[in-house]
Interface confidence: medium
């Protein structure tokens, strides 16, 4: 008789989740010599141990500590790029500007990017049918707690100038409820970080508005200034040209406003 299973509102664990995590770990450690010492089987065991046999609405940051320890990684603290609601462009940027890093360019971020996972209380099974939705079910679910934990640690490590890419096409360019707005902003360390520099990415080709004057950007500046951190904002009017100029900074068209 099939056992009754909790139905959650969100999609279930990504198919072939264990294999995907393990394969990503192996690939990452091969590409990044500084992480070659990492034992990917131990990483998977620690990852699994964070959520297997636990109620998927009762996950804590402590559950992920063994994984955090194994995935400890030093990135240049003054080369951190945060992003909110504009992941693809942020990743395209760091693929070109190889000395800058998003969270997903680190081992732990790379392992979990775009994946979903959860288990069930008191069984060693992975739930491939459904997982808790952050809004409809609970916030302390395995995926949300993971990203909150790694995002906090990533922000805490930042120093000097921290960049954040924001989506100028959204109604809330800065959203207090995003991971950036609820976790990363509040975990930048004022004694290490001098300036948060926001890059507001424009969507429309003919959009010449100064989105740095947007009320939500002013709200971000207010939060940042109260944390003793300077704030700077730049409009990126042409994201396609912006990327092109990162690739070819000597191009004559790259001296003008982008």
């Amino acid at each position: 008789v099939p056992r009754w299973r909790q139905q959650w509102s969100g999609p279930g664990t990504t198919k072939r989740f264990p294999e995907t995590v393990l394969a990503r770990c192996v690939k990452y450690t091969e590409i990044h010599p500084e992480m070659r010492h990492v034992d990917c089987q131990s990483v998977w065991d620690a990852f699994k141990g964070a959520f297997i046999s636990k109620h998927p609405c009762n996950i804590t940051e402590e559950d992920y500590q063994p994984l955090m320890k194994l995935g400890t990684q030093t990135v240049p603290c003054n080369k951190i790029l945060l992003w909110s609601r504009i992941k693809d462009l942020a990743h395209q940027f760091t693929q070109v500007q190889r000395d800058m890093f998003t969270l997903e360019d680190t081992l732990l971020g790379y392992l979990a990017d775009d994946l979903t996972w959860c288990g069930e209380f008191n069984t060693s099974k992975i739930n491939y049918q459904s997982c808790p939705d952050w809004r409809k079910d609970c916030s302390n679910n395995p995926v949300s707690v993971f990203w909150k934990t790694v995002s906090r640690r990533f922000a805490e490590a930042a120093c000097d100038v921290v960049h954040v890419m924001l989506n100028g096409s959204r109604s809330k360019i800065f959203d207090k409820n995003s991971t950036f707005g609820s976790v990363e902003v509040h975990n930048l360390q004022p004694e290490k970080v001098q300036t948060l520099e926001a890059w507001v990415i424009h969507g429309g080709r003919e959009d010449s508005r100064d989105l740095c004057q947007d009320p939500t950007i002013k709200e971000l500046e207010s939060i940042i200034s109260k944390r003793n951190i300077q704030f700077s904002c730049k409009n990126i009017y042409r994201p396609d040209k912006f990327l092109q100029c990162v690739k070819n900074p000597e191009d004559s068209s790259c001296t003008s406003e982008i």
Partner: antibody
Framework: SLEESGGDLVKPAGSLTLTCTAS?????????ICWVRQAPGKGLEWIAC???????TPYASWAKGRFTISKTSSTTVTLQVTSLTAADTATYFC????????????WGQGTLVSVSS | DVVMTQTPASVSAAVGGTVTIKCQAS??????LAWYQQKPGQPPKLLIY???NLASGVSSRFKGSRSGTEFTLTISDLECADAATYYC????????????FGGGTEVVVK
Amino acid sequence: SLEESGGDLVKPAGSLTLTCTASGFSFSTSYWICWVRQAPGKGLEWIACIYTGSGSTPYASWAKGRFTISKTSSTTVTLQVTSLTAADTATYFCARDPGVHSGTNLWGQGTLVSVSS
Amino acid sequence: DVVMTQTPASVSAAVGGTVTIKCQASEDINTLLAWYQQKPGQPPKLLIYLASNLASGVSSRFKGSRSGTEFTLTISDLECADAATYYCQCTYYGSTYGGTFGGGTEVVVK
């Protein structure tokens, strides 16, 4: 070090461009470079800053419109002043805030602007 | 812009004495405040940053403190070389506050 230049005797309603030149470091690194002025026998007055990383330019509310701060090269930042009046007569300093809240601890010696007919 | 009200405008004290200068911010600027010393014909010299941190090379006779929106610079064991004008500055340059200076305090050493 920082050195200001461009100070001069100008007539009222005239314009002037002051230049701040860095030596020993460059503005390719992200710094806050600020202009501050001091009228003879008076106190210090903050005018504007430029963040050399993004080009962000906060101004004192009284300075908006007549003053324009720009990064013109990897070693120069300028301050353009228009519609000059006698009240703009002052020594103009440029200064660098170099690190995490360590205050503006690198100053030029200043350049004198005199506005008189 | 934030308004920085500095008091007194002038203060006189004997060598070996103590001087206290206050700076009141019109709004909460956290610890985003610096103190400078300026002598005639010279640019300002940084003494204190982040309200209470001593700048490198500055004597420990200079002490900065904060209570809410009121900031204090205390100079103890006064020396003749301390005769100068002292300024406070809000060191947040963004549009929230602006890098406003206080009006200055002249310190005369007798």
